[in-house]
Interface confidence: low
């Protein structure tokens, strides 16, 4: 139903606390450089305005669209051009062009210092002084670093953060209580951020159909007892919610998400028995619980897929009459039977099936043409299975650090034009997938691996789009969302790359490396490894092993020496010469 004042409607639905949090997130995600105090001032102004509209929906400006109100607020900031440069040019445009312009200026990699966690004592003092302000600061710091974070989920994590502090600041050993809790929140929030970023990229770069297909596959896996019509209804609402959040319409997104959770709880009998435990929780926890819900058990006696999608005489008729519905049904039926497959695999299978029908339904004997379609789709299943098995074996053999090194070599050979710090960052992220997924049972390994890889490659693609350096990376990132991972896997040594000239500085180390924390020490060594591959992209595995072994021995020797710096100065050039000889 239409409301006279959209902002009053959302204020009433969400309540003042969540309303203010969402306004703060909106501002922080768009104006990533502004100080916290400036945002707080704007949040209070917007909230006061919303309250005035609640009191009188006909009051001046209350009928304006929320996006327009936000745009007007941003464009009224006196220092806008000074702080944000060409973002200020957006203010010359009319909505909806102004909104699109603001979105294009969101920075996925803002030049901000890492979000360091203060000492527990300092955290608790600040929290006790003013916990609303403290939680506001958390929302601000996360939002400006993650400008596409799923806003209602961020409110949930802020609530978890608040609960952890409420509990632990009273504990005798604050650090022992807080550290594991905040580490867990941080890890889950980072995954949540990456998941939402992939959803937004899917919508923005590949369109609504791609996102809906992704959602059908995921929801069919989670709710295999629900009918296709029910899954479709949820997917339609979920698409609206996701589009709103990705578009920066966070008040609408959070409100509509609440509505979707309410709908799912009202219809839980026809969706999933697992919803019961979620539906008794309060608003934020309820929606989060549904998002993370354990999949329901498969219905018994499911007929063979071939009955409806190969043997049925009406296959081509059904395909021609309602292509998307027929393919959607195929994706639903396939996904609910295969909770162990990744979303990417399911979408590639559906795409393969579609391509087969496109070809066969135009032929004289369609059935003869598509009769063996499932056999022909088998390589789409075997390829990722084999890849996961090989990589997990390598991970088990080498451990996380060694596995990261192997990936650093592999990805440098695939895209040597990418900067060394970026290659190390992604090798480390890809390597951590081994830790996350390889210890899981066979049934979960495959989906865990490919679903995480999709998140990591999406981030790589987003940052590469900002500063493109490799045509092969651009090709893998833009041609097809579902084929990104197979595309990267298929890349081998870049034959067009001219090896980097040898620079001794890239392999020169000093005594300060000895006192670095283990993680930073690893990163330094991995930077040298990547530089080495850029210098000799076709070096054999044996040569690399020898060089890395010599390198480790050199570091150990010099870090154990009485006069460390003298050892580095004397033995460093010898090591460089030895490495060059090994790789010659």
């Amino acid at each position: 139903e239409a409301h006279k004042s959209e902002i009053a409607h959302r204020f009433n639905d969400l309540g003042e606390g969540h309303f203010k949090g969402l306004v703060l997130i909106t501002l922080s995600q768009h104006l990533q450089k502004s100080p916290f105090e400036e945002h707080v001032k704007l949040v209070n102004e917007v909230t006061d305005f919303a309250k005035a509209c609640v009191a009188d929906e006909s009051a001046q400006n209350c009928g304006k669209a929320i996006a327009t109100l936000f745009g007007d607020k941003v464009c009224a900031i006196p220092s806008l051009r000074e702080t944000y440069g060409e973002l200020a040019d957006c203010c010359a445009k009319e909505d909806p062009d102004r909104v699109e312009c603001f979105l294009q200026h969101k920075d996925d990699n803002p030049n901000l210092p890492p979000f360091e966690r203060p000492e527990p004592e300092a955290l608790c003092t600040a929290f006790k002084e003013n916990n609303d302000r403290f939680i506001g600061h958390y929302l601000y710091e996360v939002s400006r670093r993650h400008p596409y974070f799923y806003a209602p989920e961020l409110l949930y994590y802020a609530e978890k953060y608040k609960n952890a502090l409420t509990e632990c600041c009273e504990a005798a050993d604050k650090a022992a209580c807080l550290t594991p809790k905040l580490d867990a929140i941080k890890e889950k929030a980072l995954v949540s951020s990456a998941q939402q970023r992939l959803k937004c990229a899917s919508l923005q770069k590949f369109g609504e159909r791609a996102f809906k297909a992704w959602s059908v596959a995921r929801l069919s896996q989670k709710f295999p007892k629900a009918e296709f019509a029910e899954i479709s209804t949820i997917v339609t609402s979920l698409t609206k919610v996701t589009k709103e959040c990705c578009h920066g319409d966070l008040l609408e997104c959070a409100d509509d998400r609440q509505e979707l959770a309410k709908y799912m709880c009202e219809h839980q009998d026809s969706i999933s028995s697992k919803l019961k435990e979620c539906c008794v929780k309060p608003t934020l926890q309820k929606a989060h619980c549904i998002l993370e819900i354990q999949r329901d058990e498969l219905p018994t006696e499911l007929p063979d897929l071939a009955v409806d999608f190969v043997e049925d005489k009406e296959v081509c008729k059904n395909f021609a009459e309602a292509k998307d519905v027929f393919l959607g049904t195929f994706l639903y039926e396939y996904s609910r039977r295969h909770p162990e497959y990744s979303i990417g695999m399911l979408l590639r299978i559906a795409k393969g099936y579609e391509a087969k029908l496109e070809k066969c339904c135009a032929e004289a004997d369609p059935h003869a043409c598509y009769a063996k379609v499932f056999d022909e789709l088998q390589p789409l299943i075997d390829e990722p299975k084999k890849l996961v098995q090989q990589n997990c074996e390598l991970f088990d053999k080498l451990g996380e650090y060694g596995f990261q090194n192997a990936l650093a070599v592999r990805y440098t050979q695939k895209a040597p034009q990418v900067s060394t710090p970026t290659l190390v960052e992604y090798a480390r992220k890809l390597g951590s997938v081994g830790t996350k997924c390889c210890s899981l049972p066979e049934t979960e390994r495959l989906s865990c691996t490919e679903n995480y890889l999709a998140l990591i490659l999406n981030r790589l693609c987003i940052l590469h789009e900002k500063t493109p350096v490799s045509e092969r990376v651009t090709k893998c990132c833009t041609e097809s969302l579902v084929n990104r991972r197979p595309c990267f896997s298929a890349l081998h040594v870049d034959e067009t790359y001219v090896p980097k000239p040898f620079h001794a500085d890239s392999f020169t180390f000093h005594a300060d490396i000895c006192t670095l924390p283990e993680k930073e020490k690893q990163v330094k060594k991995q930077m040298a490894l990547v530089e080495l591959v850029k210098h000799k992209p076709k070096a054999s595995e044996e040569q690399m092993k020898t060089v890395m072994g010599d390198f480790a021995a050199f570091l150990k020797k010099c870090c154990d020496a009485d006069n460390k710096e003298a050892c580095f100065t004397e033995d460093g050039p010898k090591l460089v010469a030895k490495c060059q000889a090994t790789l010659a």
Epitope: A184, D396, S439, P441
Partner: nanobody, 124 residues
Framework: EVQLVESGGGVVQPGDSLRLSCAAS????????MGWFRQAPGKEREFVSA????????YYANSVKGRFTISRDNSKNTVYLQLNSLRPEDTALYYC?????????????????WGQGTLVTVSS
Amino acid sequence: EVQLVESGGGVVQPGDSLRLSCAASGGTFSTYVMGWFRQAPGKEREFVSAISQNSIHTYYANSVKGRFTISRDNSKNTVYLQLNSLRPEDTALYYCAASRFTSWYTADYEYDYWGQGTLVTVSS
């Protein structure tokens, strides 16, 4: 619904050892991360140790590192906690917990199912 039943607690002297067991039923045991927590009288519940689904990863609180060992036998749906060199400050009710998340955590709110606990008393 997973049910967890702990056993093996008792009264021992400082320096002694104990082996706690936790038997699980009602779920696919090998898909759960298993953890041990403890709660001393009048204190908060605290994390002790956790083990991943295939026993590849184990994690310990600093206060028990080197003294306690966690292990699991997926064929028997059981997780164990070996307590060596026990100290009076180890006196507590020890709880077994199961988490269905794909990563293991030291945070109690990440665990979905809990046992009733088994009491360990270390006293001279």
